[in-house]
């Protein structure tokens, strides 16, 4: 077969051809930042030629030309600066409302890289509706004036605009209208990760965060935890395989689902899910009809199973006969359950599809959303019940118009997007399930992306302080009960003085908490062992400190989770019959287990746990410790079993401020509270100027570095007996 | 917070010794972690020594460690510092500080005491 010339060079950008010069093969090109290419692609033609999807002229010469963001083609009740055709990325446009009427979104709003505006849609409003006005976005034009219930606005783009977003809004009885925001686009737009992830996350926490399973009922028989077996999820995922995905982004799709699938099943909800390739026809991995769709690896090997080259025989887009396969699933499913039992009507589902450009054969998609919704029985009341996101990848055969009547139109969400390349798409998986949005007590959370602050990435994590001084660190295990270090109270009982500082997404120092009351281990005293010459002994060096007031749970102040608790239980996915026994053999399960804890400044450090005959060895440094333990014939003595032993290798140390702090290790992107630091060897922090210097140990330092926190699998019987209104313990 | 006042320093020739004396008003001292630190003329102020609330671990800088010797007496609310084999690097105003967590950090100390000169010269 001819193979198609090599001279499609563009000047000031780049290509890539999906399948070298060979027919079949996509050049995509792409231009740097503030550039887009004009062509996006060309498909190599059987004939050895190249074709320009789209085009009706002969072949021009690939350029990148300058983005720019549309202009406003009307303002009402107020005025916009400057006045231009269309904006220079880096341009401003401004805004000011006339007298009477107050300016709702964004006051100045600037072109992005992207050809799209930052902000929110300013809007001059002077509250006179049933709903508010719902303003116009830039480069729209909007027919309907009229805001009162039940009256309708429509929406159009002015020149070559593309619409996304609903064009006909209703002002529903609830003062809210109908869709979702219009937003008219370049062509060649894109979306940025940073601003896909969160608008992603919101709407999927909105559908998660109704289902939070654990409820507790008290009853004369004790307590007992009822789980709510209506929050049910069905997720259908749909991979484009088609010709113009190369192999290497149909693995980036393959992982990005995986990161969905591991992100999905670390909510507290029942969910299946269902796994679709599709090309020409669609191929289905896995259907939630299948019992393994349930089991988070069942489904993610399914999902590693997919082959690439199970589509080589029909490499057309065929998006319909995809979506189709989902209606012919909850068909099944329906006939299954019985379309009149809570079973079925309980069910949520959502249904996302990657693709990389618009579906070329089989029939509009549009049909098979409308026979999905019809089966579902989605309308006002039952919207939450069905969300579509369509998510298109590459920018290049992209079609905004298709991708926008397939994704779900909710007030204040968005379904619809288009990212740059899959290296974007699997940024947005990576961060979009930010659990630490929900405001109950789930615990464990963390936020993960990169640009968290500490404290986002650690909520639990509170500062003790006596005084005015910083004393000892700890850790949330309810709204209002903080576990830390016995040693840290050696004043006798007077702590009305003390404060306990907690984290609060409205100020950079936090919120200071008082005191209650504080629990102290009795079996604790740092002298116990003196006339044996063990001059300080941490046996039992735990205490529980119950805040004067509940924490308000934000995105800083989120408890983590204790093993051999219900919580915890649910956030390993572990069965309900599990005891104290199974989560420590599931979480300390190696002889050197990674974990962290908490520094001085807040960042989260490293270290390793060690069990077994490597605590023995970890342990066993103590008898060189000669100022603190004269005469140490037996290192058990002062390192029990209470104890976990950290501080070998590369290890980091805690310093004495970290004390009481957790030692929490993450798993299915839950973070468990195994241990609390106690004692050490070496201080990294001593003298130093400030919380960002640590010191690391000479190698030659004789005992060499060693750390010991208290293993809250060996208190388990003191937490029981103070915590049992608070947590959910499981059996021994 | 615990209100400090050394004594105790003076003037020595290399090779001898000095006792120092720390003593502390307020009767948390015993829950305090206490330690020395000296500044000589133009430089930083520098971690000397250290020892815990019990009295039972102490921690030294490398450039003292075997010359000299921390101890407290909770009774009597007094630190002291046993400097032997002085020497003429040795030389600067010698502080105490207290502090709950042990850490000693510069920039979060708010016990200090007013300081006593040490000179080591022949």
């Known amino acids: 077969a001819p193979s198609c010339p090599q001279n499609v060079n563009i000047s000031g950008g780049t290509f890539t051809l999906s399948h070298g010069w060979a027919p079949g093969s996509l050049l995509t090109y792409s231009c740097p930042q503030g550039l887009y290419p004009s062509p996006a692609s060309r498909l190599c033609k059987s004939s050895g030629q190249w074709q320009t999807p789209g085009a009706t002229r002969s072949l021009s010469k690939a350029v990148c030309k300058p983005v720019r963001c549309p202009a406003p083609v009307s303002f009402e009740n107020g005025i916009y600066t400057p006045r231009l055709g269309s904006y220079p990325v880096g341009g401003n446009v401004s805004f000011e409302c006339e007298d009477g009427f107050i300016l709702r979104g964004s006051p100045v709003r600037q072109c992005r890289p992207n050809g799209m505006w930052d902000g929110e849609t300013a809007v001059c409003d002077n509250g006179a509706g049933h709903c508010p006005n719902p303003g116009i976005s830039l480069g729209a034009v909007r027919t309907g004036f009229r805001f009162g219930h039940g009256d309708k606005v429509r929406y159009r783009c002015s020149s070559n605009l593309v619409l996304t977003g609903s064009s006909e809004r209703e002002c529903q009885g609830n003062g809210v209208w109908s869709g979702t925001e219009p937003i008219c686009r370049q062509p060649y737009s894109y979306d940025f990760p940073e601003d896909v992830a969160p608008a992603l996350g919101t709407s999927f926490s909105h559908m998660l965060g109704a289902t939070n399973p654990t409820q507790k009922t008290k009853e004369s028989l004790g307590r007992k935890i009822q789980i709510q077996r209506s929050g049910h999820l069905n997720l259908y995922l749909l991979l484009d395989c088609s010709q113009s995905v190369s192999e290497n982004d149909f693995l980036i799709f393959k992982e990005s689902a995986s990161l969905m699938v591991d992100r999905i099943f670390s909510f507290e909800i029942n969910v299946s899910v269902a796994i679709i390739t599709f090309a020409s026809e669609p191929k289905v991995l896995m259907s939630v009809l299948n019992d393994n769709s349930r089991d988070m690896t069942e489904v993610i090997s399914s999902l590693e199973n997919a082959n690439y080259k199970d589509h080589e025989n029909g490499t057309g887009t065929n998006t319909y006969a995809a979506l189709n396969s989902v209606y012919l699933m909850m068909n099944n499913q329906m006939r299954l359950l019985g379309m009149e039992t809570m079973a079925w009507q309980e069910i949520r589902h959502a249904i996302i599809l990657l693709t990389d450009g618009k579906s070329n054969m089989g029939g509009s998609p549009k049909t098979a959303v409308d026979h999905i919704r019809e089966i579902l029985n989605i309308n006002q009341k039952r919207n939450d019940y069905l969300d579509i996101y369509a998510i298109g990848v590459g920018k290049l055969d992209v079609d905004w118009r298709e991708l926008n009547e397939l994704g779900s139109k909710k007030d204040g969400e968005r379904h619809a997007f288009i990212l740059q390349d899959t290296k974007a798409l699997h940024q947005v998986f990576e961060h979009m399930l930010d659990v630490s949005k929900l405001t109950d007590t789930i615990c464990g959370v963390g936020n993960m992306s990169a640009n968290a602050s500490d404290q986002e990435r650690t909520p639990w994590h509170v500062t003790i302080k006596p005084k005015s001084q910083e004393t000892c660190r700890g850790a949330l295990i309810s709204d209002q009960w903080v576990l830390t270090a016995a040693h840290c109270f050696r004043d006798g009982n007077d702590h009305s003085l003390w404060r306990v500082n907690v984290g609060d997404p409205k100020s950079q120092w936090g919120k200071e908490f008082l005191i209650e009351k504080a629990v102290i281990s009795p079996g604790f005293d740092v002298f116990a062992k003196k006339n044996q010459g063990i001059l300080e002994f941490y046996g039992d060096d735990i205490a529980l400190l119950k805040l004067a007031q509940k924490v308000k749970m934000s995105t800083h102040a989120r408890p983590i989770c204790l093993p051999c608790t219900m919580e915890a239980n649910l956030a390993l996915r572990r069965p309900q019959g599990s005891t104290c026994r199974d989560h420590e053999n599931e979480l300390l399960n190696k002889q050197s287990v990674p974990a962290h804890f908490v520094a001085l400044n807040g960042s989260k450090l490293n270290i390793n746990l060690k069990m077994g005959v490597e605590w023995t060895s970890c342990a066993e440094v103590v008898s060189q410790e000669k100022t603190m333990f004269p005469n140490l014939t037996d290192v058990r003595e002062v390192v029990t079993d209470q104890f976990l032993c950290s501080g070998t290798q590369e290890d980091e140390s805690p310093c004495k401020g970290e004390s009481g702090g957790a030692v929490f290790l993450e798993r299915r992107f839950r973070f468990f509270q195994v241990g609390l630091v106690s004692w050490g060897l070496y201080n990294p922090c001593l003298g130093s100027a400030d919380k960002n210097s640590r010191k690391r140990a000479p190698r030659s330092k004789v005992p060499p570095p060693r750390d010991f926190h208290i293993n809250l699998f060996r208190m388990q019987p003191w937490l029981r007996q103070h915590l049992g209104d608070v947590l959910n313990f499981l059996p021994l | 917070q615990v209100q400090l006042v050394e004594s105790g320093g003076g003037l020595v020739q290399p090779g001898g010794s000095l006792r120092l004396s720390c003593s502390a008003s307020g009767h948390t001292f015993r829950s305090y972690y206490m330690g020395w630190f000296r500044q000589a003329p133009g430089k930083e102020r520098e971690f000397v020594a250290s020892?815990?609330?019990?009295?039972?671990?102490?921690e030294y800088a490398d450039s003292v460690k075997g010359r000299f010797t921390i101890s407290r007496d909770n009774s009597k609310n007094t630190l002291y510092l046993q400097m032997n084999s002085l020497r003429a690097e040795d030389t600067a105003a010698y502080y105490c500080a207290a502090d709950y967590s042990g850490d000693f950090l510069l920039s979060d100390l708010d016990s200090w005491g007013q300081g006593t000169l040490v000179t080591v010269s022949s």
């Open positions: 020892i815990s609330w019990t009295g039972g671990s102490t």
